[in-house]
């Protein structure tokens, strides 16, 4: 009986530790996509609707803030699209890029952790164009560090929650 009680306490401890593991999945806020034809920071994301969720991390001022030191898996998926019903592309040669950036407040500095993308020729003869970028990686992050997303040509972003999103989850503690 004592072993059973110990086992349940162990399960409970494990479960509460798992529940405390930080994670975030943020989806693009389609009503507030910035304009620009060069690299811009995407600051408007959902954290509590549809597929978007956050736990033991903070979303503030367009940045995902780490609350616990640890090794995290970071990921981002960005979709670009253009359909002729919205008009024509002013240029057919495009650089479609995403940059995942870490900013440290304690030692003011910014580092690009991941980038992805391609140069594309989107011919005006086609009715529809689509391009997707997915990047992911394993990083040591400290409490207070901030993760943000920058993209080129935000006017071409696909605004759906299953198309443009980023996130993070803690994998293990720093020894």
């Amino acid at each position: 009986e004592k072993a059973m009680v110990d086992g349940s306490w162990l399960d409970l401890a494990k479960r509460s530790k798992l529940e405390a593991q930080p994670f975030a999945h943020l989806t693009i806020n389609a009503t507030d996509i910035p304009s620009g034809s060069h690299k811009v920071s995407l600051s408007s994301w959902y954290h509590d609707r549809g597929w978007a969720k956050i736990s033991n991390m903070t979303f503030s001022n367009g940045k995902l803030i780490v609350n616990q030191d640890g090794f995290y898996y970071l990921y981002a998926n960005i979709c670009f699209r253009h359909h002729e019903t919205s008009g024509d592309l002013a240029t057919e040669y495009l650089q479609l890029m995403v940059y995942v950036t870490k900013t440290s407040i304690k030692i003011p500095s910014s580092h690009t952790l991941m980038k992805g993308g391609s140069t594309k020729y989107w011919s005006g003869n086609s009715e529809f164009h689509f391009y997707s970028i997915n990047v992911g990686g394993f990083f040591k992050l400290r409490s207070g560090e901030e993760i943000s997303i920058e993209v080129s040509n935000p006017s071409l972003l696909d605004p759906d929650q299953d198309a443009t999103y980023f996130g993070a989850f803690k994998v293990r503690d720093i020894d």
Epitope: S35, G36, S37, H82, E84, T85, S86, G87, D88, L89, A90, T91, E92, L94, N153, P154, S155, L156
Partner: antibody, heavy 126, light 103 residues
Framework: QVQLVQSGAEVRKPGASVKVSCKAS????????IHWVRQAPGQRLEWMGW????????KFSQKFQGRITVTRDTAASTAYMELRSLRSEDTAVYYC???????????????????WGQGTLVTVSS | EIVMTQSPSSLSASVGDRVTITCRAS??????LNWYQLKPGKAPRLLIY???SLQSGVPSRFSGSGSGAEFTLTISSLQPEDIATYYC?????FGQGTKVEIK
């Protein structure tokens, strides 16, 4: 304020060419596209083509492909539309119009014609 | 190629009347539809863009609605200065126009 001022009326014989100018003022010419639209007597408005004043890229209606040239002079903030091999059915009022999409804000030419020139009557008659 | 069809082709109404013009697209165009006013000898004027957004400087008696393939332009209280031909437009395609006259 934003203004588009077009050149004056022209009369041409069939087979000839005409070149219409459109001088822009009151905004940064290079940041917008200029469209050319015409209206023949009793007909609906008809889109002919556009030029991205910043990089010179152009797009034309299939109907005018091979007969139309659109150019711009950024120093003079002026766009030009030349139509060749004129026929009587090209008799129309030709308009230039600014696209509302600012190329600094994005790269889609959205076909919102927010400012128009006063129109240039081109008459093709033998 | 998308074709825009307007109805009616002309209408006659009294000052103060509510006037409605319909525009249909041959396929769905979301909300990418604009309305213009054209008076003889004058430059055309953008009234409504994106199906329902009023262009700055345009009187509030003009309004637009619709999405997909069916759209309407409404003049809530017709004024003498509204005598003109009205065109709907989606990218490269214009409707054939609706001529509005005063009774």
């Amino acid at each position: 304020q934003v203004q588009l001022v077009q050149s004056g009326a022209e009369v041409r014989k069939p087979g000839a060419s005409v070149k219409v100018s459109c001088k822009a003022s009151g905004y940064d010419f290079s940041n917008y596209a200029i469209h050319w639209v015409r209206q023949a007597p009793g007909q609906r408005l008809e889109w002919m083509g556009w030029i991205n004043a910043g990089n010179g890229n152009t797009k034309f209606s299939q109907k005018f492909q091979g007969r139309i040239t659109v150019t711009r002079d950024t120093a003079a903030s002026t766009a030009y539309m030349e139509l060749r091999s004129l026929r009587s059915e090209d008799t129309a009022v030709y308009y230039c119009a600014r696209d509302d999409s600012n190329m600094v804000r994005g790269i889609i030419i959205a076909y919102y014609f927010d400012y128009w020139g006063q129109g240039t009557l081109v008459t093709v008659s033998s | 190629e998308i074709v825009m069809t307007q109805s009616p082709s002309s209408l006659s109404a009294s000052v103060g009347d509510r006037v409605t013009i319909t525009c249909r697209a041959s396929q769905s165009i979301s909300r990418y539809l604009n309305w213009y006013q054209l008076k003889p000898g004058k430059a055309p004027r953008l009234l409504i863009y994106g199906a329902s957004s009023l262009q700055s400087g345009v009187p509030s008696r003009f309004s637009g609605s619709g999405s997909g393939a069916e759209f309407t332009l409404t003049i809530s209280s017709l004024q003498p200065e509204d005598i003109a031909t009205y065109y709907c437009q989606h990218t490269r395609a214009f409707g054939q126009g609706t001529k509005v006259e005063i009774k």
